[in-house]
């Protein structure tokens, strides 16, 4: 498979936002790239979000997506928001070179995202 690199561990902010870079080694000059974030928990894999972009253009996720991102060359900066403690898990970056042919696929080893719910503020008199 195509080589895909991503950090091993990321800690989400107190606002439930986690960011990481997904970098891939392209064999050639792809013009259309698809990036998918998958969450693996208890051997179940679910799709978190996905975006297709043209090289040189911005990465666009659907309006209701919890992901945003920017691309630069063979690097994609991904941000996942709205995370809670129960969302702690392994987030895998999948990269597909869609056009021109041939099709190339790469799967990262995953980024373990830790999310800690903030303690509620104590009532003040």
């Amino acid at each position: 498979a195509m080589h895909v690199a991503q950090p091993a561990v990321v800690l989400a902010s107190s606002r439930g936002i986690a960011s990481f870079v997904c970098e891939y080694a392209s064999p050639g000059k792809a013009t259309e790239v698809r990036v998918t974030v998958l969450r693996q928990a208890d051997s179940q894999v679910t799709e978190v979000c996905a975006a297709t972009y043209m090289m040189g253009n911005e990465l666009t996720f659907l309006d209701d997506s919890i992901c945003t991102g920017t691309s630069s060359g063979n690097q994609v900066n991904l941000t996942i928001q709205g995370l809670r403690a129960m969302d702690t898990g392994l987030y895998i970056c999948k990269v597909e070179l869609m056009y021109p042919p041939p099709y190339y696929l790469g799967i990262g080893n995953g980024t373990q995202i830790y999310v800690i719910d903030p303690e509620p503020c104590p009532d003040s008199d």
Partner: antibody, heavy 115, light 106 residues
Framework: EVKLDETGGGLVQPGRPIKLSCVAS????????MNWVRQSPEKGLEWLAQ??????????YYSDSVKGRFTISRDDSKSSVYLQMNNLRGEDMGIYYC??????WGQGTLVTVSA | DIQMTQSPASLSASVGETVTITCGTS??????LNWYQRKQGKSPQLLIF???NLADGMSSRFSGSGSGRQYSLKISSLHPDDVATYYC?????????FGSGTKLEI
């Protein structure tokens, strides 16, 4: 127009070697990983070997059935990929295709192994 | 190594019908699955790549679906020209194993 032309097939005795060649045109050869795939009535389509390109340090991969006997190589200056096949066996008979990462395929070259 | 289980081995259908071929894998291949059509005496042709994407020049009557360990190829409104052997293939990682093939007769 994309073209892949395999040559070098023919009749070969068991235990003897043979070298297949494939010349590509119509696409940027050096941007692609190249593969050899065999078709036989017994096994259908069987992936044999892959050679990656310069960004991947020309890494090679083989199926267990040919590892140690077959060698894949490439020459980007000639847009060519090769398959050196040694110590041929009866089960190596079939049509051999070269393919640019499974998107583009040649017409195939027939290898017959017989005494 | 990733094992591919393709079924059925052969199938007969009539013009205009819809048929489905399935391919199971021994582990999650994350959508890294291609489908090919091989007509008698011809080279294999890429039909579907990445489990769901139709290859250039192929009829939209062909569609691919699936994820994880289960995938399928659907051929709608069968044409006589669809007579061929269809193969699935793991393209996630080496060895890039093919399924055993499905021979379609019309």
């Amino acid at each position: 127009e994309v073209k892949l032309d395999e040559t070098g097939g023919g009749l070969v005795q068991p235990g003897r070697p043979i070298k297949l060649s494939c010349v590509a045109s119509g696409f940027t050869f050096s941007d692609n990983w190249m593969n050899w795939v065999r078709q036989s009535p017994e096994k259908g389509l069987e992936w044999l070997a892959q050679i990656r390109n310069k960004p991947y340090n020309y890494e090679t991969y083989y199926s267990d059935s040919v590892k140690g006997r077959f060698t894949i190589s490439r020459d980007d200056s000639k847009s060519s990929v090769y398959l050196q096949m040694n110590n041929l066996r009866g089960e190596d008979m079939g049509i051999y295709y070269c393919t640019a990462q499974f998107a583009y395929w040649g017409q195939g070259t027939l290898v017959t192994v017989s005494a | 190594d990733i094992q591919m289980t393709q079924s059925p081995a052969s199938l007969s259908a009539s013009v205009g019908e819809t048929v489905t071929i399935t391919c199971g894998t021994s582990e999650n291949i994350y959508g890294g699955l291609n489908w090919y059509q091989r007509k008698q005496g011809k080279s294999p042709q890429l039909l579907i790549f990445g489990a769901t994407n139709l290859a250039d020049g192929m009829s939209s009557r062909f569609s691919g679906s699936g994820s994880g360990r289960q995938y399928s190829l659907k051929i709608s409104s069968l044409h006589p020209d669809d007579v061929a052997t269809y193969y699935c293939q793991n393209v996630l990682r080496s060895p890039f194993t093919f399924g055993s093939g499905t021979k379609l007769e019309i």
